[in-house]
């Protein structure tokens, strides 16, 4: 058993049918010695008396808010949560496996640049009685500071019969140098509590591996005289690290017909312009990627050919 | 400790092309190592990230773009002295700081070159003959060093009398390649910045 926060405790259980569970001793936080009784949640049934209460915690029915009273007055509370270990592996019931980029990916994180700011998000089908708390650091043995905000519900989607809820959090490394070469990964830890179930999820990454630039901005077309060709130009996104000559991007320019089946023409360039043939009803899209370190491509920025 | 904007004339910067070749070569070699050594811990998540140049060179700090010198987090640099007469400098106006930066890059390349050559000698003794260093990568390191053209003491190739532990050697190869790729990215950024300035 360990303390998650004041008066909230996590009991770790080896989870299998007929498991013996864990013996837990609760102590009433009071100078009083006599006349103390214990109850669980809203029930008025007295579970025991005395300054300490010994319970055998086996299942969720044994978890909850234990309260010690004296003469109708509440003295203190202890909330017991359960953390299930199923055949040596901690349970992952609360969050959905996003399966990208690999199986068992519960937290996904992205950064728009090298400033040390990043966003993580996760999915669940649970809509109520759910709380998250996020901590982060650079490295784990001698951790350096990363400050995270509160996790917020950022999207709701309908997936088949189920509703899916996306939560996200923004974090910022306290002293980040954009040019630094990372040797210690960022660690992100999410505590999830659903009713009386506790779970924790972690992700470890280097900022350089989660870079996804914003799409190029100010995408414009300039027709070339007496030609079906157009000059496409764009700019680096505002959110990208500066100076751009040091933090350079490379670009992919795509001409896509109305039908998804039509052949796509693609050009790769390090410049912020390109000359392409603009077909009728086609659109031109441009996306960006770090020129020197192949992390994710940005989303496409698009303009119609007409 | 930073790169001023007054740098060589446009088109007078032969190192950019070499640094791009270097990044391509080390990335290809790393990919080959990850595929060939699939049963070894060779992915970024599995290896320890060690920098063999730590406390010996200070490339990131010495080559910091001027715009980032206002960022205090970038300025906790270690002072290191370098020889400063390189041919990539193609302009008499080149500052001392830039020379320091390029000589730091040269020292990095020299250290990695020695490590890779020592390692290759060990890998050639492996009866499994599972993996060797790409000669192209070693040649590209050499080309960039020649383009930088710094006079520096030759570091003798390390020789070991004991029987090599091939498993450890292959894991060390992965660690070196990961670190060298990260350094090659920094070198490419620096060359791009200098070329544009």
């Amino acid at each position: 058993i360990w303390e998650l926060k004041k008066d909230v405790y996590v009991v770790e259980l080896d989870w299998y049918p007929d498991a013996p569970g864990e013996m837990v001793v609760l102590t009433c936080d009071t100078p009083e010695e006599d006349g103390i009784t214990w109850t669980l949640d809203q029930s008025s049934e007295v579970l025991g008396s005395g300054k300490t209460l010994t319970i055998q915690v086996k299942e969720f029915g044994d978890a909850g808010q234990y309260t010690c009273h004296k003469g109708g007055e509440v003295l203190s509370h202890s909330l017991l949560l359960l953390h299930k270990k199923e055949d040596g592996i901690w349970s992952t019931d609360i969050l959905k496996d996003q399966k990208e980029p690999k199986n068992k990916t519960f937290l996904r994180c992205e950064a728009k640049n090298y400033s040390g700011r990043f966003t993580c998000w996760w999915l669940t089908t649970i809509s109520t009685d759910l709380t998250f708390s996020v901590k982060s650091s650079r490295g784990s043995s001698d951790p350096q500071g990363v400050t995270c905000g509160a996790a917020t519900l950022s999207a709701e989607r309908v997936r088949g019969d189920n509703k899916e809820y996306e939560y996200s959090v923004e974090c910022q490394e306290d002293s980040a140098c954009p040019a630094a070469e990372e040797s210690l990964p960022i660690e992100v830890m999410v505590d999830a509590v659903h009713k009386l179930k506790y779970e924790n999820y972690t992700s470890s990454f280097f900022i350089r591996d989660i870079i996804k630039p914003d799409p190029p901005k100010n995408l414009q077309l300039k027709p070339l005289k007496n030609s079906r060709q157009v000059e496409v130009s764009w700019e680096y996104p505002d959110t990208w690290s500066t100076p751009h000559s040091y933090f350079s991007l490379t670009f992919c320019v795509q001409v896509q017909g109305k039908s998804k089946r039509e052949k796509k023409d693609r050009v790769f360039t390090d410049k912020t312009s390109a000359t392409v043939i603009c077909r009728k009803n086609a659109s031109i899209s441009v996306r960006a990627q770090d020129r020197y370190y192949s992390s994710s491509w940005s989303e496409w920025a698009s303009v119609p050919c007409s | 400790r930073n790169l001023p904007v007054a740098t060589p004339d446009p088109g007078m910067f032969p190192c950019l092309h070499h640094s791009q070749n270097l990044l391509r070569a080390v990335s290809n070699m790393l990919q080959k190592a990850r595929q060939t050594l699939e049963f070894y811990p060779c992915t970024s998540e599995e290896i320890d990230h060690e920098d063999i140049t730590k406390d010996k060179t200070s490339t990131v700090e010495a080559c910091l773009p001027l715009e980032l010198t206002k960022n205090e987090s970038c300025l906790n640099s270690r002072e290191t002295s370098f020889i400063t007469n390189g041919s990539c400098l193609a302009s008499r106006k080149t500052s001392f700081m830039m020379a320091l930066c390029l000589s730091s890059i040269y020292e990095d390349l020299k250290m990695y070159q020695v490590e890779f050559k020592t390692m290759n000698a060990k890998l050639l003794m492996d009866p499994k003959r599972q993996i060797f260093l790409d000669q192209n990568m070693l040649a590209v390191i050499d080309e960039l060093m020649q383009a930088l053209n710094f006079n520096s003491e030759t570091v003798p190739q390390k020789s070991s009398l004991e029987e090599p532990d091939f498993y450890k050697t292959k894991i060390k190869l992965c660690i070196l390649l990961h670190a060298f790729r990260i350094r090659a990215v920094t070198i490419d950024r620096v060359m791009s910045y200098l070329n544009a300035s």
């Epitope: 080896d14 989870w15 299998y16 049918p17 007929d18 498991a19 299942e59 969720f60 270990k85 199923e86 055949d87 040596g88 592996i89 019931d93 690999k102 199986n103 068992k104 089908t125 | 049963f39 811990p41 599995e46």
Partner: antibody
């Protein structure tokens, strides 16, 4: 006392369907994940499928994906394996088993796919 | 499709020490715990060892398990006639959990 009693095995022709059941007692069935494991005659153990305690997630071996469906009825304390498009290579003894560091197995039920 | 490799058979005379190996990789045994099962002819498998080296109550202490790196082993010290059975190791793969990975199985024969 934890008990898993299996039923539903038998002889079936290739291409036909069969549904196996596993009735649980002696524990809170709705709190635990469950597996199906099979063993072809004279061969080793092969995992078939898994279902979470609440039925929210199901996982299958590649060899049965798209043909077999694992399900549970927590109100009846019963686990099911619906097998469709059966093949000769599905002939085996099928076991249900609880998920956990200490597990309990059903007695097994024989499924024979033969024309 | 077995990723955990066991010797097909091992044998010993009563009282001898018999060991069975189970060889895997970094993503399975290297990252997860190992179980061992005993299966007597015509019966369901019985758990002998869980969490690499733990014995459930009721399992004789002549059975012991260990794990090192990407392989595990089961030892029977002082093998007895009633130990003649098939033995299977089981683990998980970190990418496909909760799918159970079983070893190929080992037939233990007690001679004499």
């Amino acid at each position: 006392q934890v008990q898993l009693v299996q039923s539903g095995g038998g002889v079936v022709q290739p291409g036909r369907s069969l549904r196996l059941s596993c009735a649980a007692s002696g524990f809170t069935f709705s709190s635990y994940g469950m597996h199906w494991v099979r063993q072809a005659p004279g061969k080793g153990l092969e995992w078939v499928a898994f279902i979470r305690y609440d039925g929210s997630n199901k996982y299958y071996a590649d060899s049965v994906k798209g043909r077999f469906t694992i399900s549970r009825d927590n109100s009846k304390n019963t686990l099911y394996l619906q097998m469709k498009s059966l093949r000769a290579e599905d002939t085996a003894v099928y076991y249900c088993k609880t998920h956990g560091s200490h597990d309990n197995w059903g007695q097994g039920t024989m499924v024979t796919v033969s024309s | 499709s077995y990723v955990l490799t066991q010797p097909p058979s091992v044998s010993g005379t009563p009282g001898q020490r018999v060991t069975i190996s189970c060889s895997g990789g970094r993503s399975n045994i290297g990252s997860n715990t190992v179980k061992w099962y005993q299966q007597l002819p015509g019966t369901a498998p019985k758990l002998l060892i869980y969490r690499n080296d733990q014995r459930p109550s009721g399992v004789p202490d002549r059975f012991s398990g260990s794990k090192s790196g990407t392989s595990a082993s089961l030892a029977i010290t002082g093998v007895q006639a009633e130990d003649e059975a098939d033995y299977y190791c089981q683990s998980y793969d970190r990418g496909t959990h909760p799918a159970l990975l079983f070893g190929t199985g080992t037939k233990v024969t007690v001679l004499g």
